[in-house]
């Protein structure tokens, strides 16, 4: 039950995280105009990964896409790539994890297969979250560098009288969405990996027990179970004799009313 809850929660957290990563990637407010030096501007600038926008106080907003690939900074391209990789991995992870969910039955899929799929999706979520966090952090670092560079030459005097105020940009809402979303995806991935350990059939030390059947006696001997870590092993626990006794893992592999959430 705890495994199912951990897996389900991991899935939900990852789902929210990936939705957040997608939202952050699409958002226009990755960097917003710093109003500290000019709080009374009638024009507000903000930029995203795909386009830059200008919002006038009158309510009109104009956005222009970056219609060039070669003309864009390498760092921006890198951030785009990281976010897209994060989304793709996350999406694949979600697809895999749906089939890996313990509460969903697909044919006669064994627990070890579900464990492997859970682990795979967990790793994908972790990498996806790391990609998003890395992408957002690279962009944030770029902003900080540019901010202090533009602060150094904030005013360029023209004839000593006229001032040209250079527009500085600070962290936009998308950065915070990206960081939180990346963190959630990462946490979801870790939860999936933890759930995987619970799903995987574990090695159990059974003591030798004698069962006296009518007719002849058969003894169960220890060591008849093949150890399985759940990390790639697809072998089911082997039975020496299929009498009336079942291992704990085998009992769980059949549907019960507790398996459906």
């Amino acid at each position: 039950m705890a495994v199912t809850a951990c897996q389900g929660l991991g899935f939900v957290v990852s789902l929210i995280g990936i939705a957040g990563i997608i939202a952050a990637t699409c958002m226009d407010q990755w960097s917003t105009q710093d109003l500290y030096n000019n709080p009374v501007t009638a024009v507000f600038n903000y930029q995203g990964l795909w386009r830059s926008c200008v919002r006038e106080s009158s309510g009109f907003t104009e956005c222009r896409g970056y219609f060039t690939l070669l003309g864009l900074p390498a760092m921006l391209q890198a951030v785009r790539a990281l976010m897209i990789v994060g989304i793709v991995l996350g999406a694949i992870g979600l697809l895999v994890s749906i089939f890996a969910l313990k509460c969903i039955r697909i044919g006669s899929m064994e627990d070890s297969a579900k464990a492997n799929m859970t682990l795979t999706s967990g790793i994908m979520f972790i990498v996806s979250g790391l990609c998003a966090i890395a992408g957002v952090s690279v962009f944030a670092n770029m902003l900080v560098t540019n901010f202090w560079m533009s602060t150094a030459n904030m005013y360029t005097g023209m004839g000593g009288m006229v001032q040209t105020v250079q527009t500085r940009y600070t962290f936009g809402a998308a950065l915070f969405v990206g960081w939180v979303a990346g963190g959630l995806t990462l946490i979801g991935g870790v939860m999936m990996c933890i759930a995987c350990r619970g799903l995987a059939p574990e090695e159990t030390n059974y003591k030798a027990v004698s069962y006296h059947a009518s007719g002849h006696s058969v003894a169960y001997k220890p060591g008849g179970f093949k150890a399985s870590t759940g990390f790639g092993s697809n072998t089911k626990n082997k039975k020496i004799y299929d009498g009336g006794a079942r291992t704990e893992d085998e009992v769980q592999s059949y549907p019960s009313k507790h398996d459906y959430v």
């Epitope: 009638a42 024009v43 600038n45 106080s57 309510g59 009109f60 006229v162 105020v165 250079q166 527009t167």
Partner: antibody, heavy 117, light 113 residues
């Protein structure tokens, strides 16, 4: 079509509060900003302040302590209040709609307010 | 506050001739985000409210004759009437629409010579 009409008392006594109303039609006050501008007789234009679609306001730094701009969206009205008036506040007061580039694309006909005892 | 300075204060031009009015701002009105200059030109005829001619320094408002054109960038701007007509006699104002307060220039009175 877009129309703006200023109304209010034509004569205000010194130290009193000047109150004007701008009634608009043809556009929504939730979507567009409305500015107040004044023009003393024979002089140039002076921007007083603005109320934007979201209700936020900006005022001229020289008038900020005396001016208040508000609106009643349901009645499509914008209000200007200027306190502690003096003879220097005698002017034609205009209200105007803000458009692209923050430019004032539609103006009212203006109303002359004289400050005198 | 941004100070807008217009020159000349008054201008007399013959009908059909070119009229040029200048406007200078104390700070740049160029917005880096969209590379547009937030400067507006208005025309005010006697006894009438001002009328919008040009916004973004060079974009003509709909219905404005194409003899009116705006140019300039940063801090220096020009309004040009290519061929002066009798109905163009008015006072012309420039306005900063970039930073609050949205200050006006002192105005240029255009007359026929």
């Amino acid at each position: 079509q877009v129309q703006l009409q200023e109304s209010g008392p034509g004569l205000v006594k010194p130290s009193e509060t000047l109150s004007l109303t701008c009634t608009v039609s043809g556009f929504s006050l939730t979507s567009y900003g409305v500015s107040w501008i004044r023009q003393p007789p024979g002089k140039g234009l002076e921007w007083i302040g603005v109320i934007w679609g979201d209700g936020s306001t900006n005022y001229h730094s020289t008038l900020i302590s005396r001016v208040t701009i508000s609106k009643d969206t349901s009645k499509s009205q914008v209000f200007l209040k200027l306190s502690s008036v003096t003879a220097a506040d005698t002017a034609v007061y205009y209200c105007a709609k803000a458009g692209r580039g923050n430019a004032l694309d539609y103006w009212g006909q203006g109303t002359l307010v004289t400050v005198s005892s | 506050d941004i100070v807008m300075t217009q020159s000349p204060d008054s201008l007399a031009v013959s009908l059909g001739e070119r009229a040029t009015i200048n406007c200078k701002s104390s700070q740049s009105l160029l917005n880096s985000g969209n590379q547009k200059n937030y400067l507006t030109w208005y025309q005010q005829k006697p006894g009438q409210p001002p009328k919008l001619l040009i916004y973004w320094a060079s974009t003509r408002e709909s219905g404005v004759p194409d003899r009116f054109s705006g140019s300039g960038s940063g801090t220096d701007f020009t309004l040009t009437i290519s061929s002066l007509q009798a109905e163009d006699v008015a006072v012309y104002y420039c306005q900063n629409d970039y930073s609050f307060p949205l200050t006006f220039g002192g105005g240029t009175k255009l007359e026929i010579k």
